[in-house]
């Protein structure tokens, strides 16, 4: 349930999900890069 994040605004909720998605993509790329470099 929203990872413990509470927000009353639906658009803010969507923004939080977009940020989370972006971070997941960035961290995923970094992880893949580290594995590749090893």
């Amino acid at each position: 349930h929203s990872d413990g994040i509470f927000t009353d605004s639906y658009s803010r909720y969507r923004k939080q999900m977009a940020v989370k998605k972006y971070l997941a993509a960035v961290l995923g790329k970094r992880y893949k890069q580290r594995v590749k470099n090893k």
């Epitope: 929203s2 990872d3 605004s9 639906y10 658009s11 803010r12 969507r14 999900m17 998605k21």
Partner: antibody
């Protein structure tokens, strides 16, 4: 264009649970905000909750908190809404709907759930 | 929760005449992102609702231009400039600014 196809009508006993499915096609399922809305016979519309499948992140209406569970299966592009401890007042048409621009742009055809002893 | 109050409950209008439906919210629907998430839906008997207007005044593609939405803050209006037979339906306003998302009670539009 996104299309939503829901499961068929259900008749349930009071106290039991119902699970309604909603299969999406024509869009990136994991990146959609999938909502559930219900409509009792001859009544208005009532928002129940949503799921963002990419993180399985849910948000429920206070009224249904603890009684509704929304899940999603990305492999089949299907969302599910389970409502427990059914009572006669839960007799309604249940709709799934997809958000676009902060509004429900696409709706399923509806699933009638009848709660009767 | 935000209370959405629609008026009138029902409306009988002659073909070709104007129909006006009002919607009032208990709190401003202007979001921090600058948008107003006030929507209008049309529902015909036995069918799911259909989006007509979003962001208070943006018409859904394919919706005839006789339908228009206006208003800001807490007061909104749906206008059908020249009622056609196919416009007979129930119209709902709803807000998508604040959780929990809430709907007005609906306005039934009929032909006089």
């Amino acid at each position: 264009e996104v299309q939503l196809v829901q499961s068929g009508a259900e008749v349930k006993k009071p106290g039991s649970s119902v699970k309604v499915s909603c299969k999406a096609s024509g869009g990136t399922f994991s990146d959609l905000y999938m909502h559930w809305v219900r409509q009792a016979p001859g009544q208005g519309l009532e928002w129940m909750g949503l799921i963002y499948p990419i993180f399985a992140d849910t948000r429920y209406a206070q009224k249904f908190q603890g009684r509704v569970t929304i899940t999603a299966d990305e492999s089949t592009s299907t969302a599910y809404m389970e409502l427990s401890s059914l009572r006669s007042e839960d007799t309604a048409v249940y709709y799934c709907a997809i958000d676009q621009d902060g509004s429900f742009a696409y709706w399923g055809q509806g699933t009638l759930v009848t709660v009767s002893s | 929760d935000i209370v959405m109050t629609q008026s009138p409950d029902s409306l009988a209008v002659s073909l070709g005449e104007r129909a006006t439906i009002n919607c009032k919210s208990s709190q401003s629907l202007l979001d921090a992102d600058g948008k107003t998430y006030l929507n209008w839906l049309q529902q015909k008997p036995g069918q799911p609702p259909k989006r007509l207007i979003y962001w208070a005044s943006t018409r859904e593609s394919g919706v005839p231009d006789r339908f228009s939405g206006s208003g800001s803050g807490t007061d909104f209006t749906l206008t059908i400039s020249s009622l056609q037979a196919e416009d007979v339906a129930v119209y709902y306003c709803w807000q998508g600014t604040w959780f929990d998302l809430t709907f007005g009670g609906g306005t039934k539009v009929e032909i006089k």
